[in-house]
């Protein structure tokens, strides 16, 4: 699987999950989140050659089409597969509020 | 929705489903399929700017991150959302066989 275990410990050039830290205040303009100040969101990057972690029958067809038509603009793209939640704390007035934000951290990628 | 109804009738530059005809023999090297000779597979293409059909909480965060960091390589990607099956006919010896190939035709796209 193109997950953090594999991708972070290799120099994989093809589609893989890459490290990305997002600072809520600086990178998103969300000043009101108290904790955490930011988080390891990660992102997916890299080419999707034929047979590389293809998601559906269609992406297999498209990768094969690319083999036959190398200059074509139609190609599978490296996108998140497994996503995990992130808990945050913010204040509503003086009262702290904890929320679980779903689908915030990329754990693995796929060619779609 | 970034579907064929909208995308095929507009000159949309952002992520949208685009027309692509795949010839089984020429484009995939699949000489054994009897019918059809090819099909309208379509494909997804176009940038994924802020708020453009974002798929998950993560893709919203990434699009917002991109607004603050325009040169970043981390960005949502335009990929298939709704896929449809394609029936094919091929011969096993003299016997025709009909199969429904799932997830073969792109009907709409999303930014993931």
């Amino acid at each position: 699987a193109l997950d953090t275990n594999y991708c972070f410990s290799s120099t994989e050039k093809n589609c893989c999950v890459r490290q990305l830290y997002i600072d809520f205040r600086k990178d998103l303009g969300w000043k009101w989140i108290h904790e955490p100040k930011g988080y390891h969101a990660n992102f997916c990057l890299g080419p999707c050659p034929y047979i590389w972690s293809l998601d559906t029958q269609y992406s297999k067809v498209l990768a094969l089409y690319n083999q036959h038509n190398p200059g074509a603009s139609a190609a599978p793209c490296c996108v998140p597969q497994a996503l995990e939640p992130l808990p945050i704390v913010y204040y509503v007035g003086r009262k702290p509020k904890v929320e679980q934000l779903s689908n915030m951290i990329v754990r693995s990628c796929k060619c779609s | 929705a970034l579907d064929t109804n909208y995308c095929f009738s507009s000159t949309e530059k952002n992520c949208c489903v685009r027309q692509l005809y795949i010839d089984f023999r020429k484009d995939l090297g699949w000489k054994w399929i009897h019918e059809p000779k090819g099909y309208h597979a379509n494909f997804c293409l176009g940038p994924c700017p802020y708020i453009w059909s974002l798929d998950t909480q993560y893709s919203k965060v990434l699009a917002l991150y991109n607004q603050h960091n325009p040169g970043a390589s981390a960005a949502p990607c335009c990929v298939p959302q709704a896929l449809e099956p394609l029936p094919i006919v091929y011969y096993v010896g003299r016997k025709p066989k009909v199969e429904q190939l799932s997830n073969m035709i792109v009907r709409s796209c999303k930014c993931s």
Partner: antibody, heavy 121, light 107 residues
């Protein structure tokens, strides 16, 4: 230029629901809390609640007894306020107002033009 | 809930004079070194507009004839060299405690 444009005036029967929209432009919708404030005729301002459009987190004023529902559509940069079980006391101008951005509860730096809701049998 | 009480309820001021409006909170609205008190003006037939942020910070585009002061429970809005265009209802607002609340207004 930041703009908040609200839907038009509504006339509703007692017990019905009303849904007011607030279409925004000129800023990044997913960066700011959106508040809803109401003003009864000749009266002051009452804060109803707020929503963070990026993921739909909400905080409500208990005074509205769970009758108010706030939603947001990030694809169109539009916020919505629905008030149910309408009664005569709900006759008011309803405003959407953007939070300043430093806190969840905050000052409000841009306001919609207001939507008059009339409740009458 | 924090109750905001404004005085006076109404005020008539001659042009070029100074006007003062008071706002008293039922408990302190100071936290983390800030006073969570803001001032708005609602002109006739219009939406409210933010004048002062965090007790004393002038909002961008607002005339410097407006100034705010105070901390804890007692706050004041001053309008120097009053103009006819300043006519309207002035509201204070706190956001130190949920629910956010407004004063009843000073006309």
């Amino acid at each position: 230029e930041v703009q908040l444009v609200q839907s038009g005036a509504e006339v509703k029967k007692p017990g019905a629901s009303v849904k007011v929209s607030c279409k925004t432009s000129g800023y990044i919708f997913m960066k700011y809390w959106m508040n809803w404030v109401r003003q009864a005729p000749g009266a002051g301002l009452d804060w109803m609640g707020q929503i963070f459009p990026a993921w739909g987190s909400t905080n409500y004023n208990e005074m509205f007894e769970g009758r108010v529902t706030l939603t947001a559509d990030t694809s169109t940069s539009t916020a919505y306020m629905e008030l149910s079980s309408l009664r005569a006391g709900d006759i008011a101008v309803y405003y959407c107002a953007r939070g300043y951005g430093n806190y969840a509860l905050d000052a409000m730096d841009y306001w919609g033009q207001g939507t008059l809701v009339t409740v009458s049998s | 809930d924090i109750v905001m009480t404004q005085t006076p309820p109404s005020l008539s001021v001659s042009p070029r004079e100074t006007a003062s409006i008071s706002c008293r909170a039922s408990e302190s609205v100071d936290s983390y070194g800030n006073s969570f008190m803001h001032w708005y003006l609602q002109k006739p037939g219009q939406s409210p507009q933010l004048l002062i942020y965090l007790a004393s910070n002038l909002e961008s585009g607002v005339s410097d004839r407006f100034s705010g002061s105070g901390s804890g429970t007692d706050f004041t809005l001053r309008i120097s060299r009053v103009e006819a265009n300043d006519t309207g209802v002035y509201y204070c607002q706190q956001n130190d405690e949920d629910p956010l609340s407004f004063g009843q207004g000073t006309k």
